[in-house]
């Protein structure tokens, strides 16, 4: 069964800067990755970035730098201030659309006791939805 993992990290240098890393553990071909915050994409969450393997990357503030790390993982840097700034308990979700498995989504947030600059290891997060 495919799995999605999500890792959230707060940067030590800037407390309003977050790095989200997501990966897909499956054998299918990824066709699209959507990163959102505030809940799953399409269920109250707000899209931060859409990464297409061939067409490029479309991102919305406060997303600053999204990129493919490998063919099955992506990273996204957020830099916010004021109303658009993420906070420590913000939930970030990643949805991977793949063929032939379909869509798989997982969410994660900063570990409760994490110090700036630290993060939980990238373990698979609970899968919220598989379309």
């Amino acid at each position: 069964t495919p799995e999605v993992w999500v890792q959230v990290r707060m940067e030590a240098t800037e407390l309003s800067s977050f790095t989200i890393r997501c990966g897909f553990l499956g054998s299918g071909s990824i066709s699209l990755v959507t990163v959102s915050w505030g809940g799953p994409n399409g269920a109250g969450g707000t899209t931060l970035a859409v990464l297409h393997p061939e067409r490029g990357i479309r991102q919305w503030a406060p997303a600053r730098q999204a990129r493919w790390e490998t063919q099955s993982s992506i990273s996204l840097i957020l830099e916010g201030s004021g109303a658009s700034s993420p906070c420590a308990n913000t939930t970030f979700c990643c949805k991977f659309a793949s063929f032939p498995e379909g869509s798989w989504e997982a969410c994660g947030s900063l570990p409760p006791s994490s110090d700036p600059g630290l993060s939980a290891p990238p373990t698979p997060a609970p899968i919220l939805r598989a379309d």
Epitope: E54, R55, G56, R58, Q59, A66, R67, W68, Q71
Partner: antibody
Framework: QVQLQQPGAELVKPGTSVKLSCKAA????????MHWVKQRPGQGLEWIGE????????NYNEKFKNKATLTVDHSSSTAYMQLSSLTSEDSAVYYC?????????????WGQGTSVTVSS | DIVMTQSPSSLAMSVGQKVTMSCKSS????????????LAWYQQKPGQSPKLLVY???TRDSGVPDRFIGSGSGTDFTLTISSVQAEDLADYFC?????????FGGGTKLEIK
Amino acid sequence: QVQLQQPGAELVKPGTSVKLSCKAAGYIFTSSWMHWVKQRPGQGLEWIGEINPSDGRTNYNEKFKNKATLTVDHSSSTAYMQLSSLTSEDSAVYYCASNADRAYYTMDYWGQGTSVTVSS
Amino acid sequence: DIVMTQSPSSLAMSVGQKVTMSCKSSQSLLNGFNQRNFLAWYQQKPGQSPKLLVYFASTRDSGVPDRFIGSGSGTDFTLTISSVQAEDLADYFCQQHYSTPPTFGGGTKLEIK
């Protein structure tokens, strides 16, 4: 073939607003995002933002998010950009551009541009 | 935002000469998924709107003469005109189409001697 029609020029007063139009023809209007680009005389190109005609979703360059508002009218296959609180810095040629389906941010088809002059 | 820097700002060449112009990006434009470089080149003739010449660093748009050759990878890119023609008089802009916001270089003005 793809055509993007823009008015040639607009003369507007400082402090006012202007709404520029871009009428699309030759393709399915809702099939690709519409981009807007600014070019000041003798200078380079700046991306203002984009709108998805199918659902009205927008994406702005942070520099222009309080200056430009993008909308579309499906019935006439026309995209609009409203520029507010105009100053001399807004005097420029404004292009609309759409893209083919191969990449998000290649500007494949361009309008002829609307020259906006802000002057009292 | 990704900063694009072009050089030279202008150059004058005779018909038939080979022309090269440079574009550098402040971060890599190489897509880690498919190893494509998301870099485009545009030509803007006097009084006209820009026209797409090359995308993905080296793919010519349809109808673009094969004397226009895009190359490079990562952060360093080049547009070469193998044998310049009088009708190539124009400004040339590079643009990263890697991510939002797409950004353009300041341009290279090509003059014909």
